[in-house]
Interface confidence: low
């Protein structure tokens, strides 16, 4: 990977006035032992509300690639495969918590910081507003 | 709130031989200000694939409170506002990171932890196995 | 720390083979199910091949049975995909995954190697 040059002003591990830090062990643990990766892997396609999936790259982020959905229709699939405008095709989107290294560059430094992301499409109801 | 004892075995935050760990800022930023949380808070109830939230809380994990997704019906919704079984309810499934206090109850201490949650769910074109 | 880093992509002619090989490092790799995934250019993420732990059972999405075949080596870390009768249509971003649920939020992937197949 890439070797990121650090950072002359980043904080020592040791300072106590760091604001509001804590000491973080990133040897991840993963409680997702029974799940069968198949299984969802291919709901992006066979979904009446289909997306593609686009890489979101950022190395100073933790975890540094994100996967973001993206609706490919603005309608919805219907029973004949053709797209139905009557429905509408929306992103599911969750707030994350991700590290980011603060200041840039610092190997051992980071902050949370909370984005949104789109994790895939469902299929809705439009709100139709009736002029009077 | 609820006052957690400290555990006795915390290991110290100026502990430079604590595994693979790094300082960690919780000052949350948010990215997400130009958002409306109220546009999609209502997709729940009006996707073909609808589903209820569950509140999912550990007072030993940061974010100690997580909304976890549950499809209402096996089957989707159809224009009639009936259940069509032909179609299958499925959810969306998405890792996420999440910090777990490592010793138990330490307050400057913790680890990444990555757990599967259900963000919402989608309709999908069931796969038919064929007998031969 | 997790790598995976691909390599043997190419051009080539349609009709022609390329094998790919995915070197990986940092996890137990022989615990894990791996994946190859490809992303055509502007299309969507496709899952390609599955292999199980020991390597006894492999599932291929239906556009490449037949055509692909994908192996490891678990004393070696390593992954591979041997391409055949390769198609304008499987042009795209090859990436190795480590056993999780797609789409894949933690960054277990390489760089990806690129896949051109054209006359």
């Known amino acids: 990977g890439i070797t990121i040059p650090r950072n002359p002003g980043c904080p020592n591990s040791e300072d106590k006035n760091f604001p509001r830090t804590v000491m973080v062990n990133l040897n991840i643990h993963n409680r997702n032992t029974n799940t069968n990766p198949k299984r969802s892997s291919d709901y992006y396609n066979r979904s009446t509300s289909p997306w593609n999936l686009h890489r979101n790259e950022d190395p100073e982020r933790y975890p540094s690639v994100i996967w973001e959905a993206k609706c490919r229709h603005l309608g919805c699939i219907n029973a004949d495969g053709n797209v139905d405008y009557h429905m509408n095709s929306v992103p599911i989107q969750q707030e994350i918590l991700v590290l980011r290294r603060e200041p840039p560059h610092c190997p051992n430094s980071f902050r949370l910081e909370k984005i949104l992301v789109s994790v895939g499409c469902t299929c809705v109801t439009p709100i139709v507003h009736h002029v009077a | 709130g609820i006052t957690i004892p400290r555990n006795p075995g915390c290991p110290n935050s100026e502990d430079k031989n604590f595994p693979r760990t790094v300082m960690v800022n919780l000052n949350i930023h948010n990215r997400n200000t130009n958002t409306n949380p109220k546009r999609s808070s209502d997709y729940y109830n009006r996707s073909t694939s609808p589903w209820n939230l569950h509140r999912n809380e550990d007072p030993e994990r940061y974010p100690s409170v997580i909304w976890e997704a549950k499809c209402r019906h096996l089957g989707c919704i159809n224009a009639d506002g009936n259940v069509d079984y032909h179609m299958n309810s499925v959810p969306i499934q998405q890792e996420i990171l999440v910090l777990r206090r490592e010793p138990p109850h330490c307050p400057n201490s913790f680890r990444l932890e990555k757990i599967l949650v259900s963000v919402g769910c989608t309709c999908v074109t069931p796969i038919v196995h064929h007998v031969a | 720390e997790v790598q995976l880093v691909e390599s043997g992509g190419g051009l080539v002619l349609p009709g022609g083979s390329l094998r790919l090989s995915c070197a990986a490092s940092g996890f137990t790799f022989s615990s894990y199910s791996m994946y190859w995934v490809r992303q055509a250019p502007g299309k969507g993420l496709e899952w390609v091949a599955e292999?199980?732990?020991?390597?006894?059972?492999?599932y291929y999405v239906d556009s490449v049975k037949g055509r692909f075949t994908i192996s490891r080596d678990n004393a070696k870390n390593s992954l591979y995909l041997q391409m055949n009768s390769l198609r304008a249509e499987d042009t795209a971003v090859y990436y190795c995954a480590k056993g999780e649920i797609l789409p894949l939020y933690f960054d277990y992937w390489g760089q990806g190697t690129l896949v051109t197949v054209s006359s």
């Open positions: 292999i199980k732990q020991d390597g006894s059972e492999q």
